[in-house]
């Protein structure tokens, strides 16, 4: 029968006894940064062109014996899970392998480095179709790689890493927390986070999605027809890339942000149970493991967005967060959190030339995150009007003026330590959707977007009695661009988006009496385009 | 993810050293910047990616590169560049003594640099 | 059911050509190895090769190297046997048989074609 | 190639009465990774296709009685019939699949005596 992971990756429309998705990936090209490989395994060979390039350490140990078979071990695993006809994801993607890893599995930053550069210089000289670059390895936070990996992503290609192998915060390692690369964590057949040894997958904001990665079966370099199981970040890294080799294939002008958002929209939500992780890593890790679009075209029509979190401001009284988007992508609402509650709320700003998301903490607080709702919409023209603090006993209001612009998100921000001793606002006033209303001592900010077909609206969800979390979710069709608490007393402690559903989080309400101050309302902005589903039926 | 500039949890040296008459000032008075893996095993001290300014071109990382190697000579330090990097982004991989990083992190062009350390399989 | 079946039985001259089938159905045929196993009379089980029928990748013992040609149409689940000039000693009973996932050993084997080869 | 080796040729046993059927191979058919040997028992009766009866050197195929057991690693193995019965009667073939070309035991010829 089907391994485990394949299965996993299928949507259930594919499901038989058989893997055999749509498309293999042949307009695509995978290259993988790895171990030598054993390029004659019946599961690659004709597959895999292994290229002339090597820069690799010494092996430590004076006695360390140099066995072709443990050379080739790991990378010869990845290119068949990636690709292999027996057990690969992408059964028709053709492979390149430069080899970065010694026979111990250890390698440079300078030697990974000069690889990426051959891959640069290898699609200059002769442009080929979507190239996918996998990077099935970790080290420690690298300035440098990371830059590199950002020049090769804007320069057109995909980059697919490791989240690491660490049970840590992926962001303290490189190339898993460069922005621009899909970083991949691994779950197990129970869609549980891997545990390997001591440690296990690595976890955090910098991971983009989980990816089946314990018990994986592949071609393993003992012998030409032999296979093996192996577990880890690597494993779940070479079923992404796999997956974005097929849908590159499918549709080979994706950008890398129309990737990425695809990845995410088509991932299975929320079946990862999250008590693995620390406690402070469970709202900022995404529950998402990776799965194969149901059908390679037809989704184009939707609007994509993802929630993308900052590094955390640290405690200093006028610490900042600020969370920013992908070069493709709008920034179309901006959100907050504190886990002490002590915060200042946030604010969209220009910098350079465009939108970022800034969160503001507040005396005594042990820091924010400033939180960004980022979505694909193309020919969009996007604007923040702001209102000062109204000081009226009506709160703060701001609106949408331009004509045929809509409200996609709602920031508040304010100087004053504490919005709870003082009056909370009153609800806006209904059939006024275009319309942020906030505290009268904050100064409000609504994202303003035009975009060809964009229609949105405003949907609430208010709890009279406290509770330390509310939600309020976009139908089927609607896509959620703003998230954001009425009112911003002291008690709340942030707002943020969850795939399709908006979350405020309170105090513990154990430690708030039950008052009118108690009551907490979560309000979402829905938004569609009818542009965007149009042109995908004039397409179909 | 992480800022391409956010210096997370990773030791950030702007290290000035006295007056070279033999190193031109970085241009606009900006300082360089050392970069090293957080976590110590992995380091590879006596090896460093010396990355310059964005546009800087081939021939001038070479210049920079041999600048150095000729700035450190006189100083009895033998160098020798590993790699000249161009197409992802300028600079040049140098084996040499970290007591010559003041020195380079003056050279013109340079944004910063950075020990190697190791990376490994997951 | 998981099955294959094989063309019929063939009588030819030395020096002819021959082409014989092997027809996979209840399963996908893109995604299983197909090998060929000769049989000569009162003899052992000889492995020929193999093809995996999702990109024709072949794979031939040395001894059937250049003698056989292996293929495979993936859009009629159908692989192939081809000898371009017979001789006498091609005589024999010729298999084709499934490959168990990911292992070349084989749960399912086709009936079987004899091919007599005389003048 | 790995070749195969097969003893005995033929073998006469009583019905009910155990028997032993040994492979051997050239090289090592046993791999560190996965701590597996790749070997297979095929059994082919007369007028019929070969059929799959152990893989792995001991794992059943499913629907092989088990009276069928399979044994050994590295280069020497057995496969055993404890208690033959009239259906068992046909030639049996070890078949290493570890390496491309994949190659079989000359066969035994099991018959009762």
């Known amino acids: 029968s089907i391994p485990w992971n394949l299965e996993r990756i299928t949507p259930p429309r594919y499901r038989a006894d058989e893997y055999q998705p749509p498309d293999g990936g042949s307009l695509v090209e995978v290259y993988l940064l790895d171990t030598s490989i054993q390029s004659d395994h019946r599961e690659i060979e004709g597959r895999v062109m292994v290229t002339d390039f090597e820069n690799v350490p010494e092996e430590d140990g004076t006695r360390f014996h140099r066995q072709a078979s443990k050379c080739d071990s790991h990378g010869t695993h990845l290119a068949g899970v990636v690709s292999g006809r027996d057990a690969g994801v992408a059964k028709g993607a053709s492979m390149r392998s430069l080899r970065v890893l010694n026979c111990q599995g250890k390698g440079t930053v300078s030697g990974t480095l000069i690889g990426l550069e051959f891959i640069r210089k290898s699609q200059l000289v002769q442009p080929v179709g979507p190239l996918v670059v996998l990077l099935p390895l970790a080290g420690g936070y690298s300035r440098v790689l990371n830059a590199a990996c950002q020049r090769l992503a804007r320069a057109g290609v995909v980059l697919v890493t490791a989240a690491g192998n660490f049970r840590d915060d992926a962001c303290l390692y490189s190339p898993a927390s460069a922005p621009e690369v899909i970083t991949v964590g691994a779950t197990n057949a129970q869609d549980q986070p891997v545990t390997l040894g001591t440690l296990g997958t690595n976890f955090g904001r910098c991971v983009d999605l989980f990816a089946p990665g314990e018990d994986i079966i592949g071609a393993s370099s003992d012998c030409s027809t032999c296979f093996v199981s192996q577990s880890g970040t690597s494993q779940a890294a070479a079923h992404v890339a796999g997956i974005a080799a097929m849908m590159l294939s499918a549709e080979p002008e994706l950008t890398l942000a129309e990737l990425r958002q695809r990845l995410i929209h088509f991932s299975a939500k929320d079946v990862i149970n999250e008590a693995w992780f620390p406690e402070d890593q469970r709202v900022l890790t995404p529950n998402l493991v990776a799965a194969l679009p149901p059908s390679t075209h037809g989704a184009g029509w939707q609007l994509f967005c993802r929630t993308v979190w900052s590094a955390h401001s640290g405690p200093t009284r006028m610490a900042t967060a600020v969370a920013r988007c992908a070069p493709d992508e709008e920034l179309l609402s901006c959100s907050s959190f504190s886990r002490s509650g002590k915060r200042r709320g946030e604010r969209m700003e220009a910098q350079g030339g465009k939108l970022v998301c800034r969160a503001h903490n507040a005396f005594g607080g042990e820091g924010v995150y400033a939180i960004a709702r980022c979505c694909l919409l193309p020919q969009a023209n996007c604007s923040v009007h702001t209102a000062p603090p109204a000081e009226a006993s009506m709160g703060t209001r701001v609106h949408c003026h331009q004509q045929g612009h809509v409200l996609t998100g709602c920031s508040s921000h304010w100087e004053v330590e504490d919005l709870g001793t003082h009056k909370p606002p009153v609800l806006r006033p209904r059939g006024q959707p275009n319309q942020c209303v906030g505290h009268r001592e904050a100064s409000i900010h609504a994202s303003c977007c035009h975009a060809p077909g964009l229609e949105c609206k405003v949907k609430e969800h208010g709890i009279p009695a406290p509770q330390e979390q509310v939600t309020v979710a976009c139908e089927e069709g609607w896509t959620l661009t703003g998230c954001s608490a009425l009112p911003g007393t002291s008690h709340v402690l942030g707002a943020y988006a969850v795939d399709n559903t908006c979350v405020v989080r309170s105090r513990d309400v154990s430690t708030t009496g039950s008052t009118s101050e108690g009551a907490v309302t979560a309000v979402a902005i829905c938004c569609r385009s009818r542009h965007l589903a149009q042109a995908s039926q004039e397409l179909q | 993810q992480e800022d391409e500039d956010g210096d997370y949890e990773e030791l950030v040296l702007a290290l000035r050293s006295e007056e070279d008459g033999l190193a031109e000032a970085p241009e606009h008075g900006t300082t360089a910047t050392f970069h090293r893996c957080a976590k110590d095993p992995w380091r590879l001290p006596g090896t460093y990616v010396v990355v310059l300014k964005e546009e800087t071109h081939l021939s001038q990382s070479e210049r920079t590169a041999r600048r150095l190697q000729a700035q450190a000579a006189r100083r009895g330090y033998l160098t020798k560049i590993l790699h000249v990097f161009h197409g992802l982004l300028p600079g040049f991989l140098v084996k040499m003594s970290g007591d010559l990083l003041e020195l380079a992190l003056k050279l013109p062009h340079v944004d910063y640099i950075e020990e190697d350390s190791s990376v490994f399989a997951q | 059911q998981v099955q294959l079946v094989q063309s019929g039985a063939e009588v030819k001259k030395p020096g002819e050509s021959l082409k014989i089938s092997c027809k996979g159905s209840g399963y996908s045929f893109t995604n299983y190895w197909i090998s060929w196993v000769r049989q000569m009379p009162g003899k052992g089980l000889e492995w020929m090769g193999i093809?995996?029928?999702?990109?024709?990748?072949?794979n031939y013992s040395p001894s059937f190297q250049g003698q056989v040609t292996i293929s495979a149409d993936k859009s009629i689940s159908t692989a192939y046997l081809q000898w371009s000039s017979l001789k006498a000693s091609d005589t024999a009973m010729y298999y084709c048989?499934?490959?168990?996932?990911?292992?070349?050993?084989?749960?399912?084997w086709g009936q079987g074609t004899l091919v007599t080869v005389s003048s | 190639d790995i070749v195969m080796t097969q003893s005995p040729d033929s073998l006469a046993v009583s019905l009910g009465e155990r028997a032993t059927i040994n492979c051997r191979s050239s090289q090592s058919v046993l791999y560190s990774s996965n701590n597996k040997n790749y070997l297979a028992w095929y059994q082919q009766k007369p007028g019929q296709p070969p059929k799959l009866l152990i893989y792995w050197a001991s794992t059943r195929e499913s629907g092989v009685p088990d009276r069928f057991s399979g044994s050994g690693s590295g280069t020497d193995f057995t496969l055993t019939i404890s208690s033959l019965q009239a259906e068992d009667v046909a030639v049996y073939y070890c078949?290493?699949?570890?390496?491309?070309?994949?190659?079989f035991g000359q066969g035994t010829k099991v018959e009762i005596k």
């Open positions: 078949q290493q699949y570890s390496s491309f070309p994949i190659t």
């Open positions: 048989a499934r490959d168990y996932f990911y292992k070349p050993l084989f749960d399912i």
């Open positions: 093809i995996y029928p999702g990109d024709s990748y072949t």
